[in-house]
């Protein structure tokens, strides 16, 4: 194996030694340690945990471990003036109020500083009005309401169920529809799996459980007050009116017991179809307003949260490379949680901790990786990926010149069914080869490889005998590295069976019930899935940092570029007349993809044959591989999204969590039939095809022989 060939390596110190050192029992202990109290970003508790991790990483043997602090905009509820929603009668009396906080889980009754459920960065306000039910508040849901049902949300309070898309997109859509407030709730259809008990007897959401979360639309900006630059001691901060991505209307989340009380009285239009009905015993009427007997009653929101510039702390650990210390492989995951963080993020942080410990053990025995490995414990991820983004902004010049790869390490599990991987196509072969070498933890796959169980349970929709690997979207700390800086990135975790469990994420996501016990009792009692994820994440880092030739295969990029070009062309071809009228051609894009394919193929041949003992040629070939992802970056960024600069991938404009391919073209084509100026709209499509074709061609040329 290539990893055996790294400098200063003894036969003992190979990938196997690293993997064998990883222990499930340690991950379990670390998870317990990280989840006993809340670690909300900006709090003293989270600062103390940062210092603890710094100290332990030093003990584990890293060369240096530093805290990197920033002063960023965060959001907290008012401790003496709680947020809630009420139903008021015609006299203005509150006849129903939503919960002020979640009932605490067993054993945590006396824990202080549990932040009550709130929508981070909601403005203050006390709007009152009629309710409109907007399903998931997706773009298509508002199209259905406004265009088909002719329901006007202007001046209304909308109630939307969580799920399907990032909550910030829901709020943005509601704002654009003219709503004056948003209520978010968890419907049992999405957060209560049939046949499973609610916590503490199972992993389902109790009626009083509520999902917290930020509702920003940052589009990769990081701290809302310092877009593009680090929020350091001498930062110039925007005024709050100019801050990036803040919502303009009050927003608040509730559980399904409280949602029942709001939805059961709804009148107005019936739901348009069954896809608008959840699992509550309510009609799911759209409104506006309450039905006959209750028509004089209104809904009132009481939101008193405040935005505050607060200090946050990243922990950055360094294991210096022996041969190429100026090449960085980064493993990062966040440390801050909404409450206890049993899954998000501490199931990931515990895995990172054990990976650091294993690397440290090898280093203490005289080994070093070929390239430098950076380990990061990010702060304020839950408030908009702030810690990772500020650090990357501060170190952008180093990262764009030296960044080989970024491996993300948030939640290690969101289920216990099979592996889930999202990564750049450059890492497909690395992931395939690695998982073929790892044992599957799955029942019924004893003695079989992880690759085999993963492929069986989550087959690729395109290639038989291969597992599904998804596009990177956003909503996690890889965003700045991949979407802004063009550093090859990947993430891996254990997931649920998406076919049989249609609920969104996992039921207890961002609730007070995300505890150590949730993981230890229901998800992974033996911590075998955590161990497998540690092996995948750690194995990827090991190989990226240690292999003589970077384990990137540019031919896999060629394959997906063709697939993405075909897909976007077929979307455009839904408008054949307009394509003809406005002379829209995809020839340049297909030509560029063809060129990329041929050049990538020739590069791969040269990669097999070159003299690996020549350090200059080796470095040159590795640099071409490292900078390929960078070549897909457009310095001007995407329209209205300057920090999303990757031309091949961006978070969907309709769902931050999802990745979109050729996003510039996709967005230009989206809903084009409704544009008031079709000539201008199709002109933008043509411009985006031009940008994409140029970028693919330019990237291809970085793989050509240098002279």
């Amino acid at each position: 194996k290539s990893s055996n060939e790294a400098t200063n390596i003894t036969p003992k110190h190979n990938m196997k030694a690293f993997l064998d050192e990883l222990k499930a029992e340690n991950i379990k202990k670390f998870l317990y340690n990280f989840t006993q109290i809340p670690h909300l970003a900006g709090t003293e508790q989270n600062f103390q945990l940062a210092k603890q991790i710094q100290s332990q990483w030093k003990e584990f043997g890293l060369d240096s471990v530093e805290l990197a602090h920033y002063d960023v905009l965060l959001s907290y509820p008012n401790k003496t003036h709680p947020n809630y929603i009420s139903i008021i009668n015609e006299d203005g009396n509150e006849i129903f109020n939503t919960s002020l906080f979640e009932p605490p889980p067993p054993g945590y009754e006396n824990v202080s500083d549990i932040v009550p459920p709130f929508s981070a960065f909601s403005p203050q306000g006390m709007p009152e009005g009629d309710l409109v039910y907007v399903n998931y508040a997706r773009t298509e849901d508002f199209f259905k309401l406004e265009r088909d049902m002719k329901i006007n949300c202007s001046g209304k309070i909308v109630i939307a169920r969580y799920g399907k898309v990032f909550r910030g997109n829901k709020v943005k859509n509601a704002q654009l529809a003219g709503a004056k407030g948003v209520i978010l709730y968890s419907d049992p259809a999405d957060y209560f799996a049939p046949g499973v008990k609610s916590y503490p007897d199972g992993w389902n959401l109790p009626g009083g459980g509520v999902q917290r979360g930020n509702i920003l639309n940052l589009n990769g900006a990081g701290d809302p007050l310092t877009p593009g630059y680090p929020a350091n001691e001498y930062a110039y901060r925007r005024g709050i009116a100019e801050a990036v991505g803040l919502p303009s209307i009050p927003v608040h989340p509730i559980g399904y017991y409280d949602a029942q009380k709001l939805l059961e009285k709804m009148g107005g239009s019936a739901p348009p179809d069954s896809s608008w009905r959840g699992s509550l015993k309510v009609p799911y009427n759209v409104g506006p307003g309450f039905t006959g007997n209750f028509s004089t009653q209104k809904v009132k929101m009481h939101i008193h949260s405040t935005n505050e510039v607060t200090r946050i702390y990243n922990v950055i650990g360094t294991l210096r490379g022996a041969v190429e210390p100026d090449r960085y492989v980064i493993l990062g995951g966040h440390r801050d949680s909404w409450v206890f963080g049993g899954i998000d993020p501490q199931s990931g942080a515990a895995v990172v901790h054990e990976i650091v410990r294993s690397f440290g053990t090898l280093k203490k025995e005289g080994w070093r990786p070929r390239r430098t490995i950076l380990f990061a414990s990010w702060d304020a991820e839950e408030f908009g990926l702030l810690g990772s983004t500020e650090w990357a902004e501060e170190n952008s010049r180093l990262l764009q010149e030296r960044g080989v790869a970024y491996i993300n390490a948030d939640s290690s599990i969101e289920g216990n069914y099979t592996l889930r991987v999202d990564c750049t196509p450059l890492m497909y072969s690395l992931v395939h080869n690695l998982t073929k070498e790892l044992k599957s933890p799955d029942e019924g796959f004893e003695g079989k490889s992880l690759y085999e169980s993963w492929t069986k349970k989550s087959p690729s929709p395109e290639f038989s005998g291969m597992p599904r690997i998804s596009k990177l979207g956003s909503g996690n700390d890889f965003e700045v590295f991949f979407q802004r800086l063009g550093i090859a990135s990947g993430r891996a975790r254990y997931t649920k069976n998406w076919e049989t469990n249609k609920f969104s994420g996992y039921p207890l996501y961002h609730s007070v019930y995300e505890t150590y016990e949730l993981v230890e009792k229901f998800y992974d009692p033996m911590f075998k899935y955590h161990l497998t994820v540690a092996q995948v994440r750690g194995g990827m880092v090991f190989e990226l940092a240690n292999s003589i030739v970077l384990p990137f295969d540019c031919r896999d990029y060629a394959v997906v570029l063709r697939k993405y070009a075909d897909k976007i062309y077929s979307i455009s071809m839904k408008h054949p007349q307009e394509m003809k009228t406005y002379s829209v051609s995809f020839d340049s894009l297909f030509s560029a993809v063809k060129n990329f394919t041929e050049i990538a193929s020739k590069f791969s041949e040269r990669l097999q044959d070159f003299d690996k003992s020549n350090p200059i040629v080796l470095r040159m070939m590795n640099d071409q591989l490292m900078f390929l992802e960078r070549a897909f970056i457009d310095p001007l960024g995407l329209p209205d999204r300057p920090f999303y600069r990757h031309v091949i991938y961006a978070p969907s404009s309709h769902n931050k969590y999802a990745g979109e391919s050729f996003p510039g073209i996709y967005d230009a084509l989206f809903d084009i039939e409704s544009k008031v100026d079709p000539s201008k709209a199709w002109g933008e499509v043509k411009r985006q095809i031009y940008v994409a074709a140029f970028t693919v061609q330019a990237a291809a040329e970085t793989l050509s022989e240098v002279a």
Epitope: I95, N97, L100, P103, K261
Partner: antibody, heavy 111, light 107 residues
Framework: EIQLQQSGPELVKPGASVKMSCKAS????????MHWVKQNNGESLEWIGY????????RYNQNFNGKATLTVDKSSSTAYMQLNSLTSEDSAFYYC????GYYDAMDYWGQ | DVQITQSPSYLAASPGETITINCRAS??????LAWYQEKPGKANKLLIH???TLQSGIPSRFSGSGSGTDFTLTISSLEPEDFAMYYC?????????FGGGTKLEIK
């Protein structure tokens, strides 16, 4: 019809033990928590503890640790509470009551 | 433990009247307060849970309100069968605790 049928009154000597029963009918026994509540003559109510037949978990009010022991027989859908080292302080009415979940109020009571 | 103070402990009223019973918690219990009715020879009856949610089968003349630490049970247009003992109970934090009770008698 949902019913919780409790055993009758008991006369016991100080220092002895007593085991009372609560037979459930009209619902799936293992789907609900079974709570026990004490009421001194003409006084208020005091929660003793619960038994969850779904996973055999128990939880006790600290005031009753060592005093009360909660068990169930799933085959007969019956809950039991044993009180030991009895004193005059233990003379009271004892009720069983069910709840849908850990956080839900007690919707049906024995008598 | 959460202490629950119930008042008044005794209340006399006439059929047709509206009465209120109050409960105060020693700390915020959000909205997780239940109200029970106790009658001699009958099983206790859950009237309201989660502060204001009427249990199915309970007449709408019973209503609950409040949040945080202060809660109220209101019975409007008292019926003869409403004269009984009433207890409140917090169901957010174990050990569950009860108010001292209110005896509602016919004036």
């Amino acid at each position: 019809e949902i019913q919780l049928q409790q055993s009758g009154p008991e006369l016991v000597k100080p220092g002895a033990s007593v085991k009372m029963s609560c037979k459930a009918s009209g619902y799936t026994f293992t789907d609900y928590y079974m709570h026990w509540v004490k009421q001194n003559n003409g006084e208020s109510l005091e929660w003793i503890g619960y038994f969850n037949p779904y996973n055999d978990y128990t939880r006790y009010n600290q005031n009753f640790n060592g005093k009360a022991t909660l068990t169930v027989d799933k085959s007969s859908s019956t809950a039991y509470m044993q009180l030991n080292s009895l004193t005059s302080e233990d003379s009271a009415f004892y009720y069983c009551a069910r709840s849908d979940g850990y956080y839900d109020a007690m919707d049906y009571w024995g008598q | 433990d959460v202490q629950i103070t119930q008042s008044p402990s005794y209340l006399a009223a006439s059929p047709g009247e509206t009465i209120t019973i109050n409960c105060r918690a020693s700390k915020s219990i959000s909205k997780y307060l239940a109200w029970y009715q106790e009658k001699p020879g009958k099983a206790n009856k859950l009237l309201i849970h989660s502060g204001s949610t009427l249990q199915s089968g309970i007449p709408s003349r019973f209503s609950g309100s409040g949040s945080g630490t202060d809660f109220t049970l209101t019975i409007s247009s008292l019926e003869p069968e409403d004269f009984a003992m009433y207890y409140c109970q917090q169901h957010i934090e174990y050990p569950w605790t009860f108010g001292g009770g209110t005896k509602l008698e016919i004036k």
